[in-house]
């Protein structure tokens, strides 16, 4: 153990000094470019939404140069206050003059998770046994990336294993919320969410499998899409859980505004993805789905009964409800079925049916970041343990014992029945939508942002993300409003309804929180990403139309 | 909520007219009123709308030249056009919480 905790802390080291000189690095090109170009009026340029931008670098009003390094330079500054970047992808530089000019992405700087491998970089994950192990190739999507002229420039932070909604790993520290200092910028894209959020990256990747895009999109007031989870390439990712395919792992794009997810999109939707990864169906972007301006038909719930949703999050609900009426759509009250199921047995169960052990692996040695929680020691108790645990807390705290029975390992049958019942649920809520002839569903998203090591403790509030990940549909979220003096007022009754210490959590970890942005949720049936697109465009149109790009 | 439409009618391009649609109910006050328009041979679609707490929203056509309004003492919205065109004609309706009025027609000519 002592010699595994010595290579941990050479591990730290070894990480945090690698981030340092990449750092210097970015800075130091920046400022070059700026002695350099004077005249450039840098915060015009970073003021561009993604649209608008992509066009003045196919008319060569504007040089990728210019907007590498003024992205570089924003980047780097925003950085200091958040702790977002993890290493700077150096030979974007190079990247840069090899960048096809017909690309729909020519010269666009896209940040990246870590987890999106990237040729002679590390994606640690936080944790130290991925420490000095760097990638041979880059992963589909980025490969795919540089082919539409786009050119990753960062890598961003994650909690230690992904396996949160925090983002905090022993490696490189804690990343902060770019709004409040004081909380989390969600996770596990979390220093996506802070880098796009602070307007560092104009364009970004994460990946999902309980709300890891969405999360962080929410907290940190952008826009976020997770799609159904094979209509962009996995290749490549690095995790640290292969095979599990219950719940299924998303990657997808983060942005400013609706319209730079669809431009991402539309870019990776391309022949070249469908040639280097043919397991992915190739569906290329439906342009007349997305532009598409008939009335919708959506579905609603202001709570899923799981967690009571905070007064910020039913009235950025219901604002948009009555919005999206106004606008000439209907509503119909809708609520997937049998939730608790759904969050309690599937997909816990489904995420750890071999009992966290392939998980723990991870940890070997290791240190264990406090924002996981009790994670790993929950997963580290024998089985028989785990299940008396779950039969005497049950009275007291029904859903932490539903999670804790959910959390042991099963047989190979057990996991077939399992993932057989979650088909079956898939079905039902499809019946259901059906039945009430919906195009889409709008729904609240966890907001405002949790302070630094809640999320840890209020495991339940992923209901709201984690359904659609257990269904598979493409859900996105969308910034609509901001905590108001009232909402925070109100926040005092929160009791939540179960009254346990999830709950509890919650209620303290989103004090303080007046200015934050508050997101809904919008989602889809399953490969129907353009509509959900379309459907997060006309929320974003009716409630922060200053956010159109003309 | 019942809602009536008045103030359409033949005005030049260029010109100006106010709808006013007056509500009767006490739910107006406590819910979005929302303008549609609906042209020759056309969709109906949103024109304006203003919420509860006064936040505006402008389709792309009519922006920088319409203003939607209203006074809650009075149960009445408001929407006064200016520098019409004649891709403006078309019947005007209002909308509060589902329900809405019987149109009033606007018809902008050269």
């Known amino acids: 153990r002592w010699s595994g905790r010595r290579t941990a802390r050479g591990a730290v080291v070894r990480a945090r000094q690698r981030q340092r000189a990449g750092l210097e690095n970015m800075d130091r090109a920046a400022q070059r470019f700026r002695l350099q170009n004077p005249d450039l009026d840098s915060e015009a340029l970073l003021a561009l939404p993604l649209p608008q931008l992509v066009q003045k670098l196919h008319s060569r009003e504007l040089a990728p140069e210019a907007v590498l390094f003024t992205y570089v330079g924003k980047a780097w500054e925003v950085n200091k206050g958040t702790n977002c970047v993890t290493s700077y992808l150096a030979d974007c530089e190079t990247q840069l003059s090899q960048a096809p000019r017909q690309g729909l992405l020519y010269g666009v700087p896209v940040s990246l998770k870590e987890c999106f491998t990237y040729k002679g970089q590390d994606s640690t994950l936080g944790l130290s046994l991925n420490e000095g192990v760097p990638a041979e190739c880059d992963s589909v999507v980025v490969h795919v990336l540089k082919l539409q002229g786009a050119v990753p420039f960062v890598h961003t932070n994650v909690p230690q294993s992904m396996f949160s909604y925090d983002c905090s790993n022993p490696l490189f520290g804690q990343t902060v919320n770019p709004w409040k200092s004081s909380k989390s910028p969600g996770g596990s894209s979390g220093g996506e969410g802070a880098l796009i959020g602070s307007g560092g990256s104009p364009l970004g990747l994460g990946t999902d499998i309980g709300g890891s895009i969405r999360f962080p999109s929410s907290f940190c007031g952008i826009c976020g899409l997770k799609p159904t989870g094979n209509r962009l390439s996995k290749s490549g990712l690095k995790g640290c859980v292969y095979g599990q395919e219950a719940v299924r792992l998303s990657v997808g794009p983060m942005a400013r505004d609706v319209e730079s997810l669809a431009l991402c999109l539309r870019a990776l939707l391309c022949e070249d993805m469908f040639r280097l990864d043919p397991t992915v169906p190739p569906l290329p972007f439906r342009e007349e789905v997305y532009t598409s301006s008939q009335p919708l038909r959506v579905g609603y719930y202001e709570t899923d009964n799981y967690t009571m949703p905070s007064p910020a999050m039913r009235r950025a609900v219901l604002e948009t409800k009555q919005s999206l009426e106004a606008a000439g759509h209907t509503l119909v009250p809708f609520l997937p079925s049998n939730i608790p199921h759904a969050l309690e047995t599937l997909s816990t169960g489904g995420l750890f049916s071999d009992g966290g052990h392939t998980f723990l692996q991870n940890f070997k040695g290791d240190f264990v970041d406090p924002c996981l929680g009790d994670l790993v020691s929950i997963l580290k108790l024998p089985q028989w343990l785990k299940g008396l645990l779950a039969f005497l807390v049950k009275p007291l705290l029904p859903r932490l014992s539903a999670f804790l029975s959910n959390m042991k390992s099963r047989s190979a049958g057990k996991l077939w029945e399992l993932q057989h019942e979650i088909e079956v649920y898939r079905k039902t809520v499809i019946a259901q939508w059906r039945a009430l002839d919906l195009d889409v569903v709008l729904t609240p998203m966890l907001a405002p942002a949790l302070d630094l090591n809640a999320p840890g403790r209020a495991t339940g509030a992923v209901s709201y993300t984690m359904l659609y990940n257990c269904l598979d549909f493409p859900a996105g979220v969308v910034p609509v409003t901001t905590v108001t003096a009232e909402d925070e007022a109100q926040m005092e009754h929160y009791r939540g309804y179960f009254g346990d210490i999830w709950d509890k959590m919650l209620q303290k970890g989103m004090k303080k929180s007046v200015g934050l942005p508050v997101a809904v949720q919008c989602v889809a049936l399953p490969w129907q990403e353009e509509l959900c697109l379309r459907f997060m465009r006309e929320v974003e149109r009716l409630m922060t139309p200053e956010k159109q790009s003309s | 909520v019942q809602l009536v439409e008045s103030g359409g009618g033949l005005v030049q391009a260029g010109g100006s007219l106010r709808l006013s649609c007056a509500a009767s109910?006490?739910?107006?006050?406590?819910?979005?009123m929302a303008w549609h328009r609906q042209g020759p041979g056309k969709q109906r679609g949103l024109v304006a709308f203003i919420t509860t707490g006064g936040r505006t929203v402008y389709t792309d056509s009519v922006k920088g030249r319409f203003i939607i309004s209203r006074d809650n003492a009075k149960n009445t919205g408001f929407l006064q056009m200016n520098s019409l065109k004649p891709e403006d004609t078309a019947v005007y309706y209002c909308y509060v919480a589902g329900n809405w009025g019987q149109g009033t027609q606007v018809t902008v000519h050269h």
């Open positions: 109910g006490r739910t107006f006050s406590d819910n979005t």
